[in-house]
């Protein structure tokens, strides 16, 4: 129209999908009466009447907006509910009097996309690929308008780079009018990218301003050839016989190559392949000194059949040999002397100790134990321990039994046993001596004898308690080539008064087994024996 002023830019109204847009008719009173207004939507330059205002009363026109429009603010504002992306268009209000004027509103619609979904290449990427390979995909669903995607590596944005980085993106429109953005990052990776963190970021706008959403960070499997092979031994430090030792072959390539572990044979000077488990680990359990030697690992790239060899590694399994004691079975007369010598070999310096078997008392630190003026009590076990002080737990022991010649020695001289008449009584009698004594009983019954050790014997007698037995008691006699000795067991009938324990007697009806701690001895031989000492 000649002379008509150029149309002013429409007023911008920004709103999120699903919310209500308030379209305020900006006509001034001079431009038109707001009680008589027509509202139009403009789509592809085509106007469609959508709402009429007459005398301040609103009326929707049939069509897509029929159910979503209402008047607010005394008729000056048109409210559009449940905004969709399809509502992004120009709306205009037109006043009727005094002359037809219009006011245009541009509705802009926004929707934040969902969290970006990143998926990494599950098969990985070789470093020697001829062109950029697919690293990861990123999907941002249901945004409006189309969000922008930025890819990051280790926190830095990635830019298109010829033959190095390529980002390919596309979008699809859902039936809702929202956009789904799909992007794929293609890149040529290097070995150092094996630990690189990739993520994608979606940038989008809302009425409140610019926003962004980040995906989780991912690492991509990167394949690169092996350049170096080496051996690792567990546990670290000094190894000893009996340890579980793992010899593991390692390589700096991904995927790991095929490994074989071999051990040098000192006699043939050739390497012999060892049998590894499924993981290529050689397990030595228990480790033995024969496992000591020089190990090396060969790694094979099955694609190229190129092999790499590790630096050889010396393995030392420390050991202590069997301990030898001389004399091996010593016998001595009372009063004499004895020298016990201990020997062993080891891969390390050895320390020797002599201990008394019964008490674990340390008698000597060193390989030689000197015993003088031997008493009967000196008989028994002596243990030599050969150990490597620098390797805890590496030791071997040898036990030697010293026998002191002497007549039988009884565990007790006499003892009281509480009994009931007609009960079967189980009596026991213990004696020691060298040569080993035999035990006999002065009453008939079922006797059984068992060795406690080479110098000690225990005899058990099952006997019926009779009045005669109660009167005479029971004697056991131990004898050997050097003499004999007797113990007496007195039998006492149980009655109510005698059930009170007496400190000097054995009460109760339990098996009468002599205690080895109280020893009282006399002998029928002419040889003078030393006074008994308490042992243990």
């Amino acid at each position: 129209v000649p002379g008509e002023a150029e149309q002013p830019a429409p007023e911008l109204v920004e709103v999120e999908v699903g919310s209500t847009a308030l379209l305020k008719c900006g006509l001034s009173q001079s431009q038109g009466n707001l009680s008589h207004v027509d509202w139009f939507s403009v789509h592809k330059e085509k106007r469609t009447l959508i709402f009429r205002v007459r005398q301040g009363q609103g009326q929707s026109e049939p069509g897509e907006y029929e159910q979503r429009l209402s008047l607010q603010d005394r008729g000056a504002t048109l409210a559009l509910t449940q905004v969709t992306p399809q509502d992004e268009r120009i709306f205009l209000c037109q006043g009727k009097r005094p002359r037809s004027q219009e006011y245009r509103i541009q509705l802009r619609v926004y929707k934040a996309p969902e969290e970006p979904n990143i998926q990494v290449n599950p098969l990985g990427i070789p470093v020697n690929s001829k062109e950029p390979e697919e690293v990861a995909t990123c999907v941002g669903r249901n945004g409006y308008p189309i969000p922008q995607v930025i890819w990051y590596k280790n926190g830095r944005p990635l830019k298109e780079e010829k033959n190095r980085v390529h980002i390919q993106s596309s979008q699809t429109v859902e039936s809702s009018g929202l956009y789904t953005l799909q992007s794929i990052l293609k890149a040529q990776l290097v070995k150092e990218d094996k630990d690189a963190q990739f993520y994608c970021e979606l940038n989008y706008r809302l009425p409140s301003g610019n926003h962004m959403k980040e995906s989780r960070e991912v690492t991509v499997p990167v394949f690169y050839p092996t350049e170096k092979v080496w051996l690792e031994v567990e546990p670290v430090g000094m190894l000893k016989e009996g340890d579980r030792v793992e010899i593991r072959c390692l390589a700096d390539g991904n995927p790991p190559p095929h490994f074989s572990i071999s051990k040098g044979n000192p006699s043939t000077r050739e390497a012999e392949e060892e049998t590894t488990n499924d993981n290529g680990v050689l397990v030595l359990e228990p480790a033995r000194k024969e496992h000591s030697g020089r190990y090396e690992c060969q790694a094979w790239n099955l694609d190229t059949m190129i092999s790499l060899l590790s630096e050889p590694q010396e393995l030392l399994v420390n050991y202590v040999s069997d301990v030898r004691v001389s004399p091996a079975a010593p016998e001595r007369q009372e009063g004499s002397s004895l020298t016990l010598t201990c020997e062993a070999e080891s891969s390390q310096d050895l320390e020797f100790q002599w201990l008394r078997e019964e008490t674990d008392q340390v008698l000597e630190r060193g390989p030689v134990l000197q015993l003088h003026d031997l008493k009967r009590e000196a008989g028994g076990g002596y243990r030599c321990v050969a150990s490597v002080p620098s390797i805890p737990g590496l030791n071997r022991t040898q036990l030697v039994k010293l026998a002191i010649f002497g007549p039988p020695w009884m565990a007790f001289k006499e003892r009281k046993v509480w009994v009931k008449e007609n009960m079967v009584l189980n009596l026991s009698c213990e004696a020691s001596g060298h040569p080993r004594p035999t035990i006999s009983w002065n009453v008939n019954g079922t006797a059984s004898e068992g060795d406690q050790d080479p110098q000690r014997v225990l005899s058990t007698l099952n006997v019926l308690v009779t009045p005669e037995l109660l009167e005479t008691g029971v004697e056991c006699t131990a004898s050997n080539d050097l003499g004999k000795n007797t113990s007496i067991l007195f039998l006492e009938l149980v009655n109510l008064t005698t059930l009170t324990p007496d400190s000097n007697t054995t009460t109760g009806l339990s098996t009468s087994t002599a205690s080895p701690h109280t020893r009282a001895n006399s002998t029928s031989t002419e040889r003078k024996l030393p006074e008994p000492e308490s042992r243990g």
Epitope: N117, Q119, P122, P126, K130, E133, S170, K186, R216
Partner: antibody, heavy 118, light 106 residues
């Protein structure tokens, strides 16, 4: 539209080599990767090998030493060879397209049943 | 290797039923999971990708959920054409499929 079609022998003898061809249309092998997946009768699906849009080859480690996958982009064909066939390799062999913006298979061939028997 | 375990291995249901099929991964696979439907003598067809995204052209009665190690395929109202075998597949590290769930008519 996108189609994939497998072709190759229906019967192979033990120890022989199987060669299967997947001919594709409706997309370019330089824009989408292709995988081979097999399914023994009455059993589950098993991924065998893949070739990416960039030409990188991938193999299931269970078969790696027996497999070769290659492509001829001008003929729109992907070829799988599997050596030293065994009766346990009897299966329906499928080729499948990897979706361009994901890692799942959006289009499959109809499959070809390969029987290994003497 | 990541193992995928489906349950149940077979399932009987009637038209109109709501059906759920479970899939468990041996390690965290985030949402790198797809569901396929396979009918006898036919190739598998993708239903769901990225654990919960519906493939174009698949009816909305199919839905997927879960992340990490536990996933579910749900058919909200079973139709006659839905009787088939269903497979889950992980694509987080390599490709492995579940052993399948056969959905039969009761």
């Amino acid at each position: 539209q996108v189609t994939l079609k497998e072709s190759g022998p229906v019967l192979v003898k033990p120890t022989e080599t199987l060669t299967l061809t997947c001919t594709v249309s409706g997309f370019s092998l330089t824009s989408s990767g292709v995988s081979w997946v097999r399914q023994p009768p009455g059993k589950a699906l098993e991924w065998i090998a893949a070739i990416s849009s960039g030409g990188t080859t991938y193999y299931n480690s269970a078969f790696k030493s027996r497999l070769t996958i290659s492509r001829d982009t001008s003929k729109s064909q992907v070829v799988l060879t599997m050596t030293n066939m065994d009766p346990v390799d009897t299966a329906t062999y499928y080729c499948a397209r990897r979706y361009g913006y994901g890692w799942y298979f959006d289009f499959w061939g109809q499959g070809t049943l390969v029987t290994v028997s003497s | 290797d990541i193992q995928m375990t489906q349950s149940p291995s077979s399932l009987s249901a009637s038209v109109g039923d709501r059906v759920t099929i479970n899939c468990k991964a041996s390690q965290n696979i985030y949402n790198s999971l797809a569901w396929y439907q396979q009918k006898p003598g036919k190739a598998p067809k993708v239903l769901i990708f990225n654990a919960n995204s519906l493939q174009t052209g698949i009816p909305s009665r199919f839905s997927g959920s879960g992340s990490g190690t536990d996933f579910t395929l749900t058919i909200s109202s079973l139709q006659p054409e839905d009787f088939a075998t269903y497979y889950c597949q992980q694509f987080y590290s390599g490709y492995t499929f579940g052993q399948g769930t056969k959905l039969e008519i009761k």
